[in-house]
């Protein structure tokens, strides 16, 4: 017999998901309008075209890059698109009833929409840690509670250390990464004898999940330019970060290759590093003043990468439960972290000329705001993994992790794969 | 020549509604960030909103959100402050000023390099 | 908040300091801008970055920072200097400047 949904999910996913809908909906009613001032149409195309990079990013590239499990990827695909949907419009009311409020109605633009797709981002990143091992309905949960964690975040860095919003969004990296890994440290670990081909990739998903790397590739010199604020800065955000990620790929592929007895590249080496450039230079991307610059960063992230991608999945599979494949939780906490500190580098030798004897204080600063960010992903991870273990959720059984049968109708399958 | 000029200002009702308009010349408007600014009788100035260079992003101060949209027309160069609502305390000279970005070490810095002459808006009954 | 005094004098030829101050977030990692604004005419950039003078600006204005304090000297006072002062740094979580309370500078 192919495997059945459980019976409880079945009545819980579609009741839990619509009635949650159906709030939004009402929320949405109550309390949003369109932004009536669209003079120049022009300009609103130009605007929408960054949205539509960051949706096929969000989509399309982290999609498909989570998608190379033997028999999971259509869960992946669709289980993304699922939580972008959902994020994006629960994204869209929290960061208005942050910042808008007192106004009484929260104001729909392009950049809302954009600030959004960026937040739901986040939740992509870090279920990369945990696909495979939740259903629907635990999604759902995780969706709701680390979107509400980023955009308080957000709104705390804003107030508090008065960053603009791409220097507080730019924390994205180090807070997905670091809130997937705790929720997954929650999560059941081990893998019971005989599934264990489940985790493996398999060659048809794994192309697939090279078409993912190849989208996020072309799209994130958009991502790390979306909410600059001058187009000074925006081409200085573009081009340091293609310079970035074209010599990220060359490392990575290279370095794969390097790190391998016979010389062979892996396949998920490559999907993870080459977007390792992207991701180091994200804080400093528009303030890099020459391509020498990123592109040497570029080669640093690729060699972290791959570094990374050769000795840490032993630690994180006995750890935290990650297969081997699930690499964008480390790698994105280690390349975030290194451009966290290329910041605070940038922010030494700024701070020496913009009045004297606030260096420490500068440096403690941004070390206070990236701290706050771990320690809140760390906290609202862990958080989401007990809410996530509760019998409600019906979890499915170890010994259907990362099973595309337990989720989808295939009407040409009468047992197993 | 690089210029701003205002105009739209002029005496409303409590509760009555203005649309301020500022023309740019001498520069191209959609590279820059604007700005509107007033200065109240008797009191300092104050900074109203700003609307970025794409016109994607807009903000105000927290006494006019829900009543001002500031928005632009980059093909005719202009840019705007649509003004409902008004209360007697919005009587003031309004300021269109346009947003310069220089870059540093670990941030860009922006102020307001260029201002209008300013139109001024009466609340009155 | 940006406070500054709200008045200040002197005589002709004379040198006047104004003063600026606030939070570390506001004023401690960001640089300072001072503009004039004339009786009936729009405010002029006076001062950027801290201490530059944008071209058109005599040199007898200067401007200085420290820590969370910045200052405005106007050296060889004349009676055209009369006018309001204000020291503006960028707030990045507003999206604008934030304009200190000005300074009333009277040229006896």
């Known amino acids: 017999m192919s495997s059945k949904y459980p019976r409880s999910v079945r009545r819980c996913l579609p009741l839990w998901a619509l009635t949650l809908e159906a709030a939004l909906i009402l929320l949405f009613y109550f309390f949003t309008h369109y932004d009536a001032s669209l003079e120049d149409q022009k300009g609103l195309v130009a605007s929408y075209q960054v949205g539509q990079d960051l949706t096929v990013m969000a989509a399309i590239g982290l999609g498909f890059l989570t998608s190379s499990f033997r028999r999971h990827s259509w869960s992946s695909v669709a289980f993304n698109l699922f939580m972008l949907a959902l994020g994006v419009q629960w994204a869209i009311l929290l960061d208005g009833f942050l910042s808008q409020f007192p106004s009484g109605k929260v104001v729909i633009t392009l950049f809302s929409i954009r600030l959004a797709t960026m937040s739901a981002l986040s939740v992509l990143i870090s279920v990369d840690a945990v696909l495979g091992k939740v259903n629907l309905a635990q999604l759902v949960v995780m969706v709701l509670v680390e979107v509400t964690a980023l955009g308080n975040l957000r709104m705390v860095i804003s107030n508090i250390f008065n960053t603009d919003y791409h220097m507080n969004m730019m924390h994205i990296y180090v807070f997905a990464a670091y809130f997937g890994l705790s929720v997954a440290w929650c999560l059941p670990k081990p893998l019971p004898e005989g599934t264990e081909d489940k985790d493996q990739t398999a060659t048809i998903p794994s192309l697939s999940a090279m078409l993912g790397a190849l989208f996020l590739w072309m799209f994130w010199p958009s991502f790390n330019s979306a909410l600059l604020r001058s187009p000074i800065e925006r081409k200085n955000a573009v081009f340091n970060t293609y310079y970035a990620v074209a010599v990220s790929v060359v490392t990575a592929i290279s370095g794969s290759s390097l790190a391998h007895p016979q010389g062979k590249i892996s396949k998920t080496y490559v999907h993870s590093a080459v977007l390792a450039g992207g991701v180091a230079v994200g804080t400093s991307c528009h303030l890099i003043p020459s391509p020498w610059l990123a592109m040497v960063l570029g080669l640093v992230a690729g060699l972290i990468s791959v570094g990374g991608a050769k000795y840490l999945p032993g630690c994180c599979n006995r750890v935290l439960g990650i297969p081997h494949s699930s690499i964008m939780g480390y790698n994105f906490s280690l390349l975030g972290l290194l451009g966290e500190i290329i910041y605070i580098v940038l922010l030494v030798l700024d701070t020496v000329g913009a009045g004297n004897g606030m260096i420490g204080f500068q440096v403690l600063l941004s070390i206070g705001e990236l701290s706050l960010a771990i320690v809140i992903a760390l906290m609202s991870g862990l958080l989401t993994g007990l809410l996530l273990n509760l019998k409600i959720w019906k979890a499915p059984h170890e010994a259907k992790y990362f099973d595309d049968q337990v989720f989808w109708k295939f009407p040409h399958l009468a047992v197993g794969f | 020549q690089v210029k701003l000029l205002e105009s739209g200002g002029g005496v409303v009702q409590p509760g009555g509604s203005l649309r301020l308009s500022c023309v740019a010349s001498?520069?191209?408007?959609?590279?820059?960030?604007m700005h509107w600014v007033r200065q109240a009788p008797g009191k300092g100035l104050e900074w109203v909103a700003f609307i970025w260079f794409d016109g994607s992003n807009k903000g105000y101060v927290d006494s006019v959100k829900g009543r001002f949209t500031i928005s632009r027309d980059n093909s005719k160069n202009m840019v705007y402050l649509q003004m409902n609502s008004l209360r007697a305390d919005d009587t003031a000279v309004y300021y269109c000023?346009?947003?310069?970005?220089?870059?540093?070490?670990?941030?860009?810095?922006?102020?307001?390099?260029?201002w209008g002459k300013g139109t001024t808006v009466t609340v009155s009954s | 908040v940006v406070t500054q005094p709200p008045s200040a004098s002197g005589t002709p030829g004379q040198r006047v300091t104004i003063s600026c101050s606030g939070s570390n977030s506001i004023l401690g990692s960001k640089y300072v801008y001072w503009y004039q604004k004339l009786p009936g005419t729009a405010p002029k950039l006076l001062i950027y970055?801290?201490?530059q003078r944008p071209s058109g600006v005599s040199d007898r204005f200067s401007g200085s920072k420290s820590g969370t304090s910045a200052s405005l000297a106007i050296s060889g006072l004349r009676s055209e200097d009369e006018a309001d002062y204000y020291c503006a740094p960028w707030d990045a979580n507003l999206g604008g400047p934030v304009f200190g309370g000005g300074t009333k500078l009277t040229v006896l």
């Open positions: 970055k801290n201490d």
């Open positions: 000023a346009r947003e310069k970005a220089l870059r540093g070490i670990s941030r860009y810095n922006y102020y307001l390099d260029v």
């Open positions: 001498g520069f191209t408007l959609r590279s820059y960030g």
